[in-house]
């Protein structure tokens, strides 16, 4: 078992004549995610066939506006990696199809009007465990940059993430017909627990290394589909002439799910309700203790020292499921205020302020003079979703509330003194200059610098600067 | 601009057959994360959904109906079939079909785009 | 199954009222959606995935909740909001909906 990561890095116009026009406009605002399909082998990159290595999908990214006129630049993306886990055996050869697609935000008639704006696929070869791959694929005018990689979960290790490694039972070997983990080799390998490829909705196992199928399905790897030979039905011959109108066997059929599982079907899979004591796609995990990591993204796993006595999981926030394995829609709770858009990061939840709020849940307001007061004769200036006090002289600070020392910076020139003034500031200026802040020499000859001192005011004065 | 259209016969008789067609336009079959449902609705009563097919031919049918159900698509032709055999006047109802939309790969995002329903009487 | 229990049955209101409905499923669900009928025309969709407002929805629809328990809110009703409402879940087959809310004009 592994996951595989996709990083975007850009999403905008390729080089070269015919610049795309923008997804988005002023009074069609929208916003960018993108989804990602996996396949194993070099297969076709036809987008109907199933993402039999999984599917990903990303957050929504930044609302974005196009200004008029203005050519299609890199557009806002989504935070944070696509992630696909897959649980099998990397395959080493993939193809994938990586879509973008933009989310309108205008008032639209019916539901969220989503539309496809590029499609990008390909094949190729990656080790699970390898550095970022980086890629840039381009569909029409559009380009699209990115980088990926597939890392095994623990306890898989390998290429392939097939090779199982736990913590030795004994400090000296592994048990019989086990060989050290290399590189780790204070731990062992473990035996793979179905074969490498097996069809996880259409396959099973029950000893390690099998791959059994479920009604419907044959093959080593149980992904090919039993042909319907004829319409003997429980339903009778269909007179369609497209042939013969048997459904396909669901995913329920025949019960994949071991240990006395219950199983439902989803919108497109199924899902094991599992016993205590069993875990797995399947349930078919047993015999669990925490030595085994039972619990998911980080749960942490009480109890259960011996195979008999049950193990209890306590899950991080974000995580819930008796092993910590599902998710909680966090963001459905909506706890950003004030029209904020709520990211589920996964560790944490952020929330992306509208413009005039602030905080971690945008609960503070920054927004307006409306009822807020500068103090000491202080002007209240609105910008940018905020406002700001522009202060009389001698006063500063967010509210205008603090005096502030014209003197603190030292104004007065060439080591003249500075005194406060309910007006300013005055420097008194040391012997042979003179100026509103001493800046100018007065001449041996008595003659300044300057054309003429101000009327009352004689060179050497202290200067009050206005 | 999204559209869903049933179509099919008002009035069949007990133990036939229904076979109802949904045609739509301003999306297609062929692009992933689309689906197509069928839901129904008894006079008076809830609505009840049927069956739905996606687009890389994942099928999924009401339990207590299954025996009685087949729904095909022809990509080609923007079009979603749905078969009914054994028709009981239990089954009178308005018949819609709607826009399924799967981003994530069983999460269904919305059923966003309904047709204007079919009312079928079965009655001999 | 998974049962979809809606209450009230029935609700009588007035315009400017805040109005809240409920509908509890009888399994956890991961999200919750939510469709206003009005008779003789078919059902449109209001809220996806819990709490996001399908477009051309008015503001003062809003939905929460989560597990087995959740809510649609109508914060200041509408002369056009009198209809019946619908929740449903998309967990697991049947994905089966709620027996309906009828917002009535008091």
């Known amino acids: 078992a592994g996951v595989f990561e996709l990083q975007i890095h850009s999403f905008g116009p390729g080089p070269g004549p015919g610049a795309p026009r923008s997804p988005c406009s002023a009074r069609l605002p929208c916003r960018l995610f993108f989804r990602v399909c996996l396949k194993p082998g070099l297969s076709e990159e036809a987008a109907e066939s199933p993402c039999a290595l999984g599917a990903a999908l990303s957050a929504r990214g930044p609302v974005y506006t196009e200004q008029p006129g203005a050519p299609a630049p890199d557009l806002p993306l989504p935070d944070g990696l696509l992630q696909v886990p897959f649980r099998d055996a990397w395959p080493g050869t993939f193809s994938f199809i990586i879509e973008t697609w933009r989310e309108e935000l205008g008032d639209q008639i019916g539901g969220p009007a989503w539309s496809l704006l590029a499609r990008v696929a390909g094949r190729r070869r990656l080790a699970a465990g390898g550095p970022w791959a980086r890629d840039i694929q381009r569909a029409g005018a559009w380009e699209l940059r990115f980088s990926y990689r597939a890392r095994c979960e623990p306890p898989a290790v390998g290429t392939a993430c097939t090779r199982l490694c736990r913590p030795r039972s004994a400090p000296s070997r592994c048990g019989p017909g086990l060989r050290p983990c290399a590189p780790l080799e204070d731990e062992c390998e473990a035996p793979l627990v179905c074969r490498a490829g097996c069809s996880p909705e259409h396959g099973f196992c029950e000893q390690p290394g099998e791959c059994r199928c479920l009604e419907g399905w044959t093959g080593p790897l149980c992904t090919v589909p039993v042909s319907t030979s004829s319409c003997l039905s429980p339903r009778g011959p269909s007179s369609a002439t497209t042939g013969c109108l048997v459904p396909g066997p669901g995913p329920c059929d025949g019960n994949p799910c071991a240990n006395g599982g219950s199983c439902s079907e989803t919108p497109r899979s199924f899902e094991c309700t599992c016993p205590r004591g069993f875990y797995g796609l399947r349930c078919e995990v047993s015999g669990v203790t925490c030595a085994d990591g039972p619990c998911f993204n980080g749960g942490l796993c009480v109890g259960g020292a011996d195979p008999d006595s049950a193990y209890i999981c306590h899950c991080p926030p974000g995580f819930q499921g008796s092993n910590c394995e599902k998710r909680v829609d966090r963001c459905s709770l909506q706890p950003c205020r004030n029209g904020g858009l709520c990211l589920d990061l996964g560790h944490a939840l952020r929330c992306r302020c509208r413009a005039g709020f602030a905080g971690p849940r945008c609960e503070h307001d920054l927004d307006d003079c409306a009822g807020r007061a500068c103090a000491n004769g202080g002007t209240c200036v609105e910008g940018g979703g905020a406002h700001r006090c522009s202060c009389a002289l001698g006063f500063g600070g967010r509210d205008c509330r603090e005096r502030a020392d014209p003197c603190a910076a030292r104004p007065c020139a060439h080591g003249g003194r500075c005194y406060a003034h309910f007006s300013g500031l005055v420097c008194a200026c040391a012997p042979g200059y003179m100026g509103a802040r001493c800046e100018f020499p007065v001449h041996p000859d008595g003659a300044s610098a300057l054309p003429a001192a101000p009327p009352g005011l004689r060179p050497g004065d202290p200067q009050r600067y206005l | 601009q999204i559209t869903l259209k049933e179509s099919g016969p008002t009035l069949v008789k007990p133990t036939q057959t229904l076979t109802l067609t949904c045609t739509f336009s301003g999306f297609s079959l062929s692009t992933s994360g689309m689906g197509v449902g069928w839901i129904r609705q008894p006079p008076g009563k809830a609505l009840e959904w049927l069956a739905h097919i996606w687009w890389d031919d994942v099928k999924r049918y009401s339990p207590s109906l299954k025996s009685r159900l087949t729904i095909t698509k022809d990509t080609s032709k923007n079009q979603v079939v749905l078969t009914m055999t054994n028709m009981d006047p239990v089954d009178t109802a308005t018949y819609y079909c709607?826009?399924?939309?799967?981003?994530?790969?069983?999460?269904?995002?919305?059923?966003?785009?309904w047709g204007q329903g079919t009312l079928v009487t079965v009655s001999s | 199954d998974i049962q979809m229990t809606q209450s009230p049955s029935s609700l009588s209101a007035s315009v400017g009222d805040r109005v809240t409905i409920t509908c509890s499923a009888s399994h956890s669900v991961s999200y919750m959606y939510w469709y206003q009928q009005k008779p003789g025309k078919a059902p449109k969709l209001l809220i996806y995935?819990?709490?996001n407002l399908a477009s051309g929805v008015p503001s003062r629809f809003s939905g929460s909740g989560s597990g087995t328990d959740f809510t649609l809110t109508i914060s200041s009703l509408q002369p056009e909001d009198f209809a019946t409402y619908y929740c449903q879940q998309w967990r697991s087959n049947p994905f089966t909906f709620g027996q309906g809310t009828k917002l009535e004009i008091k």
């Open positions: 709607a826009r399924i939309v799967s981003f994530d790969n069983d999460v269904v995002s919305a059923m966003d785009y």
């Open positions: 995935l819990t709490s």
